[in-house]
């Protein structure tokens, strides 16, 4: 179990000890003020105290201050996500400035040491915001930290000891290990800045959990359920790597927090939103895809602060690499008759058809079970724009092409062998768009054809009634 | 080690105002958030709030707000904990205790008594 | 605010029993959850944070579990110093808020 008290071991052990010298030792954490894009340009090393490098590197007391605070380390040096966040960066807010952490000294270190010394790092730099405090002109309300892993919760040890509140803190898959259940003020929490934005994007409700499974922010999202990441399985890096190993799998998805964040910074065009919703499950299910009462947000860069009394948990689905922006919708379906189900569920697949392009044939998730005379709810997504959807092909696939499905048929025949075709029947699709919030309904094409078995497909026209907006607030419409 | 230490015990008219103080030791004062925590005779713990010493920011639980001050001495690692408006109901012992992991090491206890 | 409801409000054991003490969040306090002993006339000494970590000298007589809305407190062997009241207390969110109290008697 974790070494209570922190960065020196316990806290009875935290005795005052003399600080070395500047000539013994260079700081265990220094401030780049990082005044290119180029990662091989060294910029500028800022130190409590020191005011030329300020003027020298030309920082911009008025503008946004950024602090990106990287994590633990197995290398002991920068990693590629570093130079990408720092670009993507002073590519959209020009005039900022980008300052980034330096803790390797202390991060290149037996996990749990490195864990122990975020305290000391969050406070190092809540001395170096207190200094700049005392600048005219500047103001803690335009600092944002940006922390990934470690350096998440580092960033609300540093809004916690600020003397005053930082404007923003955004943690990049805070890490897990040592964290999970901690004290409010051990981790990142919601009191560390005006606004907390959180993804999760590698945790595990089995096994190890790199990143934290709770909420600790005022906005927690997490894409694709915040575990498996689309383009992160095995096969995906055994492709991409020579030698690819599960170290990979879990980088790749682990870091794909900080590629979701670079990607709503570089693609501010394809804006992806993520919907309120109490758990995976009923994100899975489609029920969560309003955005009434500030119900969706843009996430990464783009998301609009939120401080609701309680902690909102935000989900979405994404593609497997940028931009990672897809199009949500919830399809309705209402079964009002079934005949013959047998133990099997059914297997549905969807096309969509729609102004701009049609979809792929896209799986209906049944996460518990079809209910009939109930309209059973799903999730679909695209990622290409449909425009406005046209039709809908509704296919049930035949028992053989999956195997599971025919062992299941097998087992079902065995013990009802003159059991009879297997129908239900859909009169309507109801769908929504999580982009557009619109509504619209679907009919059979044949009124007189509701039916649908194994093998076959249905195909649905917009009903006469058209589009219907029912008081829903686009997530393209500015939040307030 | 860590040690906190309080004042000694208070008995107080309604009305009137309390000040607790807690003397730490032992470990970074700055740094941790030091909570003050109430129990009235044969009652569980009730929570009043808590101040971190580095910046005097401060929680406080919305029952006591207005009503609670807490503030602290950096030269001296001490907190203070004022409570006004005392009421018979304020009767209780009161702790100091050092939040890392939890509420990791208490004081020894401030009994207050408020009578006429 | 969060509620935590502890149960039983008391009860009576002997050396060696098995105890078990519940407490119940209102809302998913995930596993941000600490115990407490506290001995008559003394301060409350912290047991168990992260609903399963023990904490320094704690013996390992004394069990942590749970996670969301319910846990546990287990006491695998009653030993004679363990009479005295437990409290939980979550610390997910400001305030922190404490369940009422299980006192164990001796039987």
């Known amino acids: 179990s974790p070494v209570p008290f922190g960065p020196e071991g316990r806290l009875e052990d935290k005795l005052h000890k003399p600080k070395a010298t500047q000539t013994e030792v260079k700081p265990s954490v220094r401030f780049n003020l990082r005044t290119s894009k180029d990662p091989e340009h060294e910029g500028c090393y800022l130190s409590v105290g020191h005011s030329q490098p300020l003027e020298d590197c030309s920082f911009n007391m008025t503008a946004k201050t950024f602090f990106i605070i990287h994590g633990w380390t197995m290398s002991g040096i920068f990693e590629n996500w570093l130079h990408k966040l720092v670009s993507a960066l002073h590519t959209r807010e020009k005039d900022a400035n980008v300052v980034v952490v330096d803790w390797l000294p202390l991060a290149h270190q037996l996990y749990t040491d490195a864990v122990n010394n975020t305290r000391v790092v969050g406070h190092s730099i809540a001395r170096m915001l207190d200094w700049l405090q005392e600048k005219d002109d500047f103001s803690l309300g335009n600092v944002h930290l940006i922390g990934y892993s470690l350096g998440a919760h580092v960033a609300g040890y540093a809004g916690n000891f600020v003397k005053g509140t930082v404007g923003r803190i955004t943690g990049l898959d805070p890490a897990g290990p040592m964290f999970e259940g901690a004290d409010i003020h051990k981790r990142l929490s919601p009191d560390d800045a005006d606004f907390v934005d959180v993804l999760h994007t590698y945790t595990r409700s089995f096994g190890l959990s790199i990143g934290i499974q709770m909420p600790v922010g005022h906005i927690d999202i997490y894409p694709n359920g915040g575990d498996f990441q689309p383009g992160c399985g095995l096969n995906d890096v055994l492709g991409s790597i020579a030698y690819g190993t599960i170290t990979e799998v879990v980088k790749c998805e682990h870091e794909r927090a900080v590629h979701l964040f670079v990607d709503s910074l570089v693609n501010q065009d394809k804006p992806s939103f993520a919907f309120q919703c109490t758990d995976s499950n009923r994100f899975k299910k489609g029920i969560c895809l309003s955005c009434r009462k500030n119900r969706c947000n843009s996430i990464g860069y783009n998301a609009k602060k939120m401080r609701n009394k309680r902690n909102s948990k935000m989900y979405l689905k994404t593609r497997a690499g940028m931009p990672f922006r897809v199009y949500h919708y919830q399809m309705k379906i209402h079964v009002f008759s079934y005949k013959n189900m047998g133990e099997i569920e059914p297997t549905f697949y969807v096309t969509l058809y729609g102004t701009n392009a049609d979809s792929q044939t896209l799986p209906l998730e049944i996460v518990e079970r079809i209910e009939q005379n109930a309209t059973n709810t799903f999730l679909v997504y695209t990622e290409e724009d449909l425009g406005d959807l046209l039709k809908i092909q509704l296919t049930w696939e035949g028992a053989s092409q999956s195997w599971y499905n025919l062992w299941k048929e097998f087992r079902s025949y065995l013990s009802q062998p003159r059991n009879p075709g297997r129908e239900l029947n859909i009169r309507r699709i109801r769908v929504k768009s999580g982009e557009t919030q619109r509504k619209l309904t679907f009919c059979t094409e044949d009124p007189e054809n509701t039916s649908i078995s194994p093998g076959r497909e249905l195909w649905f026209r917009k009903c006469r009634d058209g589009w219907r907006m029912k008081n829903e607030t686009s997530p393209t419409v500015e939040l307030p | 080690q860590v040690q906190l230490v309080q004042s000694g015990a208070e008995v107080k008219k309604p009305g009137a105002s309390v000040k607790v103080s807690c003397k730490a030791s032992g470990y970074t004062f700055t740094t941790y958030w030091i909570a003050w925590v109430r129990q009235a005779p044969g009652q569980g713990l009730e929570w009043m709030g808590e101040i971190l010493p580095g910046s005097a920011k401060t929680k406080y639980n919305k029952k006591f707000k207005g009503r609670v001050t807490m503030t602290r001495d950096t030269s001296t690692s001490t907190v203070y904990m004022e409570l006004s408006s005392l009421r018979s109901e304020d009767t209780a012992v009161y702790y100091c205790?050092?939040?890392?992991?939890?509420?990791?090491?208490w004081g020894q206890g401030t009994t207050v008594t408020v009578s006429s | 605010d969060i509620q935590m409801t502890q149960s039983p409000s008391s009860l009576s054991a002997s050396v060696g029993d098995r105890v078990t003490i519940t407490c119940k969040a209102s809302?998913?306090?995930?596993?941000?959850v600490a115990w407490y002993q506290q001995k008559p006339g003394k301060s409350p000494k912290l047991l168990i944070y992260?609903?399963?970590y023990r904490f320094t000298g704690v013996p390992s007589r004394f069990t942590g579990s749970g996670a969301g809305t319910d846990f546990t407190l287990t006491i695998s062997s009653l030993q004679p110093e363990d009479f005295a009241t437990y409290y939980c207390?979550?610390?997910?969110?400001?305030?922190?808020?404490f369940g009422g109290g299980t006192k164990v008697e001796i039987k």
């Open positions: 207390q979550q610390h997910y969110s400001i305030p922190r808020t």
């Open positions: 809302q998913d306090v995930y596993t941000a």
């Open positions: 992260s609903a399963s």
């Open positions: 205790a050092v939040y890392d992991y939890g509420a990791d090491y």
